[in-house]
Interface confidence: low
């Protein structure tokens, strides 16, 4: 419906604490390098203005939409042409250009300093001191970091981050209470990040077509009793709510957000059996909630899908009649009986169940043609399968850190010319798909594994496409969204790449490491792996587990040294002539 | 229905080692961080180890630090204490605790086990 003023009907909506809280996010997900006193200035004076129109919605100026509004606001920041560059040359633009140009500049991998945390009694200091500043720079410093963060979800997290600091300030033992909520925060908010990343790939590289049919899989595995007519109105709705945020439209993500947990709660009878719970918390925790409550329990006795995929007459009439209909049919039907499948493998056979009803039902004997298209589904799916099999195996064999490292070793291999700290940051989170995965059941295994692998995939497509430098990553990452994984696996040893050349100092190491947290030595491990593959990527796997192992000992011998930095230059120097020998460098 | 079932706890002289252990059931364990608290005798609760889903990190009291080890097996459903030169004003009963993700109340956990340090 439309309103005089979009800013006081969103102001009236959401209230003034979550209206100010998500045009921070939306400001700092936009101009990431901008000091918060700056974003807090001018969130205020949007607040002001935003009062203004609530009172009188034909105030100057308050029928503008949003996008003038806050892109007018962004555009009166002094130091923009310094601090961003060509990103300035938007604030040229008109709307809705002017917006899209914001949207093409964010950046995945902005080079901010990494976020250290203080000590508890620091933190609990400046929390007691100044909440309401606290918590909005918790906000900022997430939402700059990740663009694309889910905006009504960081509120969430952000509520969440408070309640630990005003329970556990007043603790006895205060880091007891607040570490591993911290940890838990921090662990979950990249998670958060990294799902919403792929929403947001996939709208915007892909087209809203792809994303509704990832939620049609979804949503059916989720909710298999509700009717497809259900599942589709939830489409809808959810692809209006992930467009309006991965378009930096939060205000109206968040109020529509709001409008479908309400509308699910209050039809959950013929939607789910297991959103009872959810339904009875406050809005953030029942959004939260709903996102991630478990499959309901599949109706009993559910008929074949042949009959009506396969046997039926009238399939190539009901595939021409409505083809997006009949083929979200069709993917309704197969995802409600597969919670088991990923949500990738679902939406592959219903690409395969597509292609072939385009060939068939031009043919001159259309059911003869399609009569053995499930056929051709089996080795889809036991391609995942055997592959989730062998991983799961050597994860156990080898435990998380040395699983990391021979995909580490793998991709590497694949995709030599992605820099180091992509290939480690991407391999490692790969690696964590063992842990997370390999000890559910088979019947979770795969969407457990093959869907976060997607989610991974796509940090490596959305980093490499800032800085592209290998046509098969661009290859794998824009040819399909779901054959993204399976073109990955599919790379071989990459034949064409010149080995880099050797660089002492990449293997120069100093006593510092020896203070580092057991991850971040990890990773400099890690990182001297991938260097190591770089410059010898024929070396086999029992030469370069011979040189890391030495590395190792290197490292521990030397952080025992009484003299540990005389230890690293002198032990340093012999590792890296024997590890030359070693590899033939 | 979520079950949190402690053990291993009994009497034990100062400087002596137990290690008690908690089988829980009911809940996905491998994605809950999980705790130890113990009461003293006529004394309030007070929190002695913290372990993330993951197992790590951990976090200790300072009461406990460089004595008590917590760790878990997500494949046996199961927390463990491993309690090294144990003093007198460690007896309590000890319980394990499902860590809860936002407000700190205790929705779920076990009955204790009694650990009683004397000589």
């Known amino acids: 419906d439309a309103h005089k003023s979009e800013v006081a009907h969103r102001f009236k909506d959401l209230g003034e604490e979550n209206f100010k809280a998500l045009v921070l996010i939306a400001f700092a997900q936009y101009l990431q390098q901008c000091p918060f006193e700056d974003h807090v200035k001018l969130v205020n004076e949007v607040t002001e203005f935003a009062k203004t129109c609530v009172a009188d919605e034909s105030a100057e100026n308050c029928d503008k939409s949003l996008h003038t509004l806050f892109g007018d606001k962004l555009c009166t920041v002094a130091t923009l042409r310094e601090t961003y560059g060509e990103m300035a040359d938007c604030c040229a633009k008109q709307e809705p250009e002017r917006n899209e140009c914001f949207l093409q500049h964010k950046d995945d991998n902005p080079n901010l300093p990494r976020l250290v945390r203080p000590e508890v009694d620091v933190m609990c200091t400046a929390f007691h001191d100044n909440e309401e500043t606290f918590l909005k720079k918790y906000l900022y410093e997430i939402a700059r970091r990740h663009p694309y963060f889910y905006a009504p979800e960081l509120l969430f997290f952000a509520k969440r981050y408070k309640a630990a600091f005003t329970e556990c300030c007043q603790a006895a033992d205060k880091a007891a209470c607040l570490l591993p909520k911290l940890d838990e925060l921090r662990d979950e908010g990249k998670a958060s990040s990294a799902k919403q990343r792929l929403k947001c790939a996939s709208l915007q590289k892909f087209g809203e077509r792809a994303f509704k049919a990832w939620a049609v899989a979804r949503l059916s595995q989720r909710f298999p009793k509700a009717e497809f007519a259900e599942v589709s109105k939830l489409v809808t709705d959810l692809t209006k709510v992930h467009t309006e945020c991965c378009h930096g439209d939060l205000l109206e993500c968040a109020d529509d957000r709001a409008d479908l947990a309400k509308y699910i709660c209050e039809n959950q009878d013929s939607i789910s059996s297991k959103l009872k719970e959810c339904c009875e918390k406050p809005l953030l925790e029942k959004s939260h909630c709903i996102a991630e409550v478990e499959n309901d329990e599949m109706p009993a006795d559910l008929p074949s899908l042949a009959a009506d995929f396969v046997e039926s007459k009238d399939v190539c009439k009901n595939y021409a009649e409505a083809k997006d209909v009949f083929l979200g049919m069709f993917l309704y039907e197969y995802a409600r009986r597969h919670p088991d499948y990923s949500v990738v493998l679902l939406l592959r056979l219903a690409k395969t169940y597509e292609t072939t009803l385009e060939k068939c039902c031009a043919a001159a004997d259309p059911h003869e043609c399609y009569a053995k298209v499930f056929d051709e589904f089996k080795p889809l799916v036991e391609e995942p399968q055997n592959l989730i099999k062998q991983n799961c195996e050597l994860f156990e064999q080898l435990g998380e850190y040395k699983f990391q490292n021979a995909l580490l070793v793998r991709y590497t291999k694949k995709v030599p010319q992605v820099s180091t700290p992509t290939l480690v940051e991407v391999s490692r989170n790969l690696g964590k798909v063992g842990s997370k995965c390999c000890k559910h059941p088979e019947a979770k295994r795969m969407p457990c594994a093959e869907d976060y692998l997607s989610v991974v995939l796509n940090q490596l497509c959305v980093l490499h496409e800032k800085t592209p430098v290998s046509d098969r990553v661009t290859k794998c990452c824009t040819e399909s969204l779901v054959n993204r994984r399976p073109c990955f696996s599919a790379l071989e040893v990459d034949e064409t790449y010149v080995p880099k050349e050797f660089n002492a100092e990449t293997f120069t190491f100093h006593a510092d490491i020896c203070t580092l947290s057991e991850k971040e030595r990890q990773i400099k491990k890690q990182t001297a792996l991938v260097e190591l593959v770089k410059h010898k990527p024929k070396a086999t796997k029992e030469q370069l587990k011979a040189v890391m192992d030495d590395f190792a000992a290197f490292v521990e011998k030397c952080c025992k040294a009484d003299d540990k930095e005389t230890c690293f230059a002198e032990e340093g120097k012999k590792l890296v002539a024997a590890s030359q020998a070693a590899l033939g460098l | 229905e979520v079950q949190l079932l402690e053990s291993g706890g009994g009497l034990v002289q100062p400087g002596g080692s137990l290690r008690l252990s908690c089988a829980a059931s009911?809940?996905?364990?491998?994605?809950?961080?999980m705790l130890w608290v113990r009461q003293a005798p006529g004394k309030g609760l007070e929190w002695v180890s913290v372990i993330h889903q993951s197992g790590t990190p951990t976090y200790y009291a300072d009461s406990v630090k460089g004595r008590f080890t917590i760790s878990r097996d997500n494949s046996k459903n199961t927390l463990y204490l491993q309690m090294n030169s144990l003093r007198a004003e460690d007896t309590a009963l000890y319980y394990c605790a499902k860590f809860p993700s936002s407000r700190m109340k205790f929705d779920y956990w076990g009955q204790g086990t009694l650990v009683k340090v004397s000589s």
């Open positions: 009911g809940f996905t364990f491998d994605t809950s961080s």
